[in-house]
């Protein structure tokens, strides 16, 4: 099966790598612009230079291109706890991340929120916190895991999944209650 190519890809594939086909004259291949620049004017003829201009402040191109405009720099989302790891330059977009001892939770492909890594209080660290994953905790006896926190079995209701982990404690509580009633 031949993969479907868009018009731009079809046009580019006629020219050697690093060049693109002139939009008004398909017999001319123009040199693409370097990263950090954009296409101001197509090359006037074969072997002649493409007019590329440097991206203005607040914009970038990260690879060779024949874009008519540079791309706008991303802004880190403060409302999601994001911080700027590195500023935008003409050839690289802003890099956003989280603070130390935080991890990224992706709500969607291009939206993440920063959260504090769990400390595993009343438990031990099974897997350390990673850039995109919270700490994985193992709870001490008498505690169960709820939303990645070790919670006392005294907070375990019979209807919840924790009953298996807290079975001895629940039976003891039941026994105590029974012995107190005559």
């Amino acid at each position: 099966l031949v993969p479907h190519l868009g018009d731009r890809e079809k046009r580019d594939s006629v020219c050697p790598q690093g060049k693109y086909i002139h939009p008004q004259n398909n017999s001319i291949c123009c040199t693409k612009c370097h990263k950090g620049t954009y296409l101001y004017n197509d090359c006037p003829g074969p072997g002649q230079d493409t007019d590329c201009r440097e991206c203005e402040s607040g914009s970038f191109t990260a690879s060779e291109n024949h874009l008519r405009h540079c791309l706008s720099c991303s802004k880190c989302r403060k409302e999601m706890g994001q911080v700027e790891i590195s500023s935008c330059t003409v050839d690289r977009d802003t890099v956003c991340g989280c603070r130390k001892n935080q991890y990224r939770h992706y709500w969607s492909e291009n939206l993440f929120q920063c959260f504090n890594c769990s400390l595993c209080l009343n438990g031990t660290v099974h897997l350390s916190c990673q850039e995109k994953q919270n700490t994985v905790c193992t709870c001490h006896a008498g505690f169960f895991l709820r939303e990645n926190e070790c919670v006392s079995c005294s907070n375990c209701k019979k209807s919840l999944e924790c009953t298996k982990l807290c079975l001895p404690q629940i039976e003891n509580v039941k026994g105590t209650e029974d012995s107190g009633t005559t």
Epitope: R77, K78, E79, M80, G81, H105, W107, Q113, F115, N116, E147, N148
Partner: nanobody, 119 residues
């Protein structure tokens, strides 16, 4: 008691508009991010849009960018979603939600309002 009550859903033709509202009570509405999340039939949850406490920062999923507008009125404890140029693929139950700042869950959810885009 915390309540998030969505309204404004319904049946609309492709290209039409709807305005969803979410009336909040039982918590300090003006603190923190509020979001609209949707679930299309047989699909998972999709984060549609969010807005920060003062409305100064907004986010839109690529699928709705340029068509949907999120806003809030903290004096009325209400969140809005203006939906224009609606498409069949926007058909879903739309939920108003308050994301937690402590863990990747929602502190509060509404019951949802159904938006059906069909001719």
């Amino acid at each position: 008691e915390v309540q998030l009550l969505e309204s404004g859903g319904g049946l609309v033709q492709p290209g039409g508009s709807l305005r969803l509202s979410c009336a909040a009570s039982g918590f300090t509405f003006g603190n923190g991010v509020m979001a609209w999340v949707r679930q299309a039939p047989g699909k998972g949850l999709e984060w549609v849009s969010h807005i920060n406490e003062n409305g100064g920062a907004t986010y839109y999923a690529d699928s709705v960018k340029g068509r949907f507008t999120i806003s809030r009125d903290n004096s009325k404890n209400t969140l809005y979603l203006q939906m224009n140029s609606l498409r069949a693929e926007d058909t879903a139950v739309y939920y108003c939600a308050k994301p937690s700042i402590e863990s990747p869950i929602f502190d509060y959810w509404g019951q949802g309002t159904l938006v059906t885009v069909s001719s």
